[in-house]
Interface confidence: medium
């Protein structure tokens, strides 16, 4: 049997050591103990008694099925306890009585059906994070379960087999910053929603089939709900249930952000928000995020004209990796307040982009992200976007562009352009001179000789440059990131010729540790203030005797340098 490894600060690692019991020899010097992925099965009353100063105890996936009632009695300083993914079929309030300092408790993934016959947590007045429940057996949430808890930063409940929710069970917790609920069906959603309206600021619903969700007025008085964010992850919706969900918004008037991740819409986008007051109640929603939305019949999808008015006040929209090939012109024109639009990882091509960015489209748009679509012509893309009079930032990275021409047109206010991972080999005057930030990372550039008088930040890492670009090209440059190129040296003269340079990230290049370079680095301790990741990322590539040495540590041979 292997033993623990502990560092000087009392952090002890005993993960995956095949322990069959809590190891002996634990001491009061231990601050953190991780015994995850073992075969401990049983924790006796004296097993942890020596650990009076323990602050972190992690017992994840250790096959524990029995814990004596007073096993944790000496752990008054414990702040973090993880008992997740064990075999605890029942929970005891006596375990937690002594743990008055506890801030984090994870009981998830154990096969209990309820949280126990009495309240588990009345003494945990400092608790900030609580994770409970499991996939198969946790079936009932009761009013006694959360007694004594008044405020939590995070509460996560995995209740995919929930058979009953006693009304007002969650109401006793007056303030929950982030509540994550794993519910397989929408059956208890209305009750739970009613109980958390006045306490939860961010509600995240996971793995829920909402296809049969039906709204009914909630049995609540007028509440001023603090909820600012609502997220659905791995949920299944239909056109009808989406309409029903919208009706919940009348109870959360301060909602500012809605998110759908990895959801499936079994519908055609035939939304019909029947309640006219829904429109005004969406008034404070500023951010809508949709990632990896799966629409089995996406080829039959509607034009969304029924929700145009819902989105007129939204400022930030992300629809990522969801097979978007067109935002209809009329929809774009309705997005009057939109300042940020991210359509990364979709199917946009120039022909349809032209329709999306029609005259009057996205009149307030400042940032457009079209990363990893199917754009091919930089020239055509710039021309299409001339309609966007307020556009300052454009990300067209991860598109495979044809070689750029000498001349292109771009929106006149554009200051930021991301062309990273676009396969470009040469930069030409197609790139606008108005830019303040340019990202051409991860391309095939072996030189950069474009004059950009306003450029303040240049990102050119992961290319093939052998030297730093000429400083005269960028008179006001503040930041240059040129990692992972083939730069062999830099000198005092080179760096000195960038009059305003504050940050240079040039690590992981192929430095030739010549007498000049090593002398310069030895004589210039101030390099540490300019060079990011100095000294660890700055290694000699040659000569062979210094290969792998840090520039800072490498010493030139007296013979070589004083001939």
């Amino acid at each position: 049997q292997e033993s623990l490894s502990c560092d000087a600060s009392g952090v002890c690692d005993g993960r995956s050591r095949s322990f069959t019991s809590i190891p002996s020899g634990l001491t009061a010097a231990m601050k953190s103990l991780d015994l995850s992925f073992n075969k401990i099965t049983y924790i006796g009353h004296g097993d942890l008694r020596a650990c009076a100063n323990l602050q972190v105890l992690i017992l994840k996936s250790s096959r524990i099925n029995t814990i004596e009632g007073d096993a944790f009695y000496s752990l008054g300083s414990l702040e973090h306890l993880d008992l997740s993914d064990n075999h605890l079929s029942s929970l005891s309030s006596s375990w937690f009585g002594p743990l008055s300092s506890l801030k984090y408790l994870n009981l998830m993934g154990n096969p209990y059906q309820t949280l126990g016959v009495t309240s588990l947590f009345p003494n945990l007045t400092n608790l900030q994070t609580l994770r409970i429940g499991n996939v198969e057996t946790f079936s009932e949430i009761r009013r006694i379960d959360f007694a004594g808890l008044t405020s939590l930063n995070e509460l996560e409940i995995k209740a995919l087999s929930l058979r009953n929710y006693q009304s007002q069970s969650l109401k006793s917790i007056r303030d929950i910053h982030h509540l994550t609920l794993h519910l397989s069906e929408s059956a208890f959603l209305l009750e739970i929603f009613a109980d958390i309206l006045s306490s939860v600021r961010y509600l995240e619903l996971r793995d829920t089939n909402l296809a049969r969700f039906q709204f009914s007025p909630l049995p609540v008085d007028e509440v001023s709900s603090p909820m600012k964010k609502l997220a659905f992850r791995g949920s299944v919706l239909t056109d009808e249930s989406f309409n029903e969900l919208l009706k919940l918004l009348r109870y959360i008037l301060e909602l500012s952000e809605v998110e759908f991740d990895d959801c499936t819409l079994n519908g055609l986008g035939d939304f019909n928000p029947s309640e006219s007051d829904v429109v005004s109640e969406l008034g404070k929603v500023e951010t809508v995020t949709i990632r990896r939305l799966h629409i089995p019949q996406f080829y039959l999808f509607y034009d969304l004209s029924t929700v145009y008015s819902l989105l007129e006040k939204v400022k930030r929209i992300t629809v990522e990796n969801s097979k978007v090939f067109l935002v209809p012109c009329s929809f774009s024109q309705h997005l009057k307040s939109l300042e940020f639009l991210d359509l990364s990882e979709n199917l946009m091509v120039e022909e349809y982009l032209k329709n999306s960015a029609c005259k009057g489209a996205w009149p307030s748009l400042q940032t457009l992200v079209l990363s990893q679509n199917h754009l091919r012509s930089m020239q055509k893309t710039g021309e299409i976007l001339l309609t966007l009079k307020n556009l300052t930032s454009l990300d067209i990275s991860r598109n495979t562009f044809h070689p750029m021409p000498d001349s292109c047109q771009w929106p006149e206010k554009m200051r930021f352009l991301n062309l990273s991972s676009t396969g470009i080999r040469v930069v030409k005057t197609c790139i606008p001179q108005t830019l303040e930030v340019l990202d051409v990372s991860n391309n095939n550039l072996d030189s950069f000789s474009l004059f950009l008088p306003r450029l303040q930040e240049l990102y050119i890492s992961r290319n093939k440059l052998k030297t730093l670009p000429d400083a005269s090209l960028f008179p006001v440059l503040l930041v240059m990131k040129i990692r992972e190129n083939a730069v062999s040296t830099f000198s005092k003269d080179q760096l000195g010729s960038f009059p305003k340079l504050e940050t240079l990230e040039a690590g992981d290049n192929h430095f030739v540790c010549s007498c000049e370079l090593l002398s310069f680095t030895m004589e210039t301790p101030a390099l540490a203030q300019i060079l990011v990741d100095w000294p660890d990322s700055y290694l000699c590539d040659s000569p062979p005797r210094l290969h792998g040495h840090r520039l800072q540590d490498a010493r030139p041979s007296v013979l070589e340098c004083h001939q």
Epitope: R142, N164, S167, Q168, A187, L190, E191, S216, P219
Partner: nanobody, 124 residues
Framework: EVQLVESGGGLVQAEGSLRLSCVAS????MGWFRQASGKEREFVAA??????????DSADSAKGRFTISRDNAKNTVYLQMTSLKPEDTGVYYC???????????????????WGQGTQVTVSS
């Protein structure tokens, strides 16, 4: 509108038993409440659609003596009362939550539909 019809009340000796029935027009979360003369309506038991039950938390309640059950095929909910005491005397009401609610509740305000009540009198 959900119609609720209670039956089974009556006069019974202390330590005796009674079974109350409530027929509903539909399958809902159902509850039994009671009201003694001059007192507030008090939660007795509740049952959800799948048969999970809920009783009052307090130790001196009827839990252990009273059992709620349902027969969905007959749209009927039962309250089996044993070891009855004089303090169990009162009007027993059957209540139903709206169709879209699935969780049990001990709060009268969460129930939208109510029966007319059936009198239970326990003599000593």
């Amino acid at each position: 509108e959900v119609q609720l019809v209670e039956s089974g009340g009556g006069l019974v000796q202390a330590e005796g038993s009674l079974r109350l029935s409530c027929v509903a027009s539909g399958t809902h979360v159902m509850g039994w409440f009671r009201q003694a003369s001059g007192k507030e309506r008090e939660f007795v038991a509740a049952i959800n659609r799948s048969g999970s039950t809920d009783y009052p938390d307090s130790a001196d309640s009827a839990k252990g003596r009273f059992t709620i059950s349902r027969d969905n095929a007959k749209n009927t909910v039962y309250l089996q009362m044993t070891s009855l005491k004089p303090e169990d005397t009162g009007v027993y009401y059957c209540a139903a939550r709206k169709a879209f609610y699935f969780g049990t509740s001990s709060y009268p305000s969460d129930y939208a539909y109510w029966g007319q009540g059936t009198q239970v009198t326990v003599s000593s």
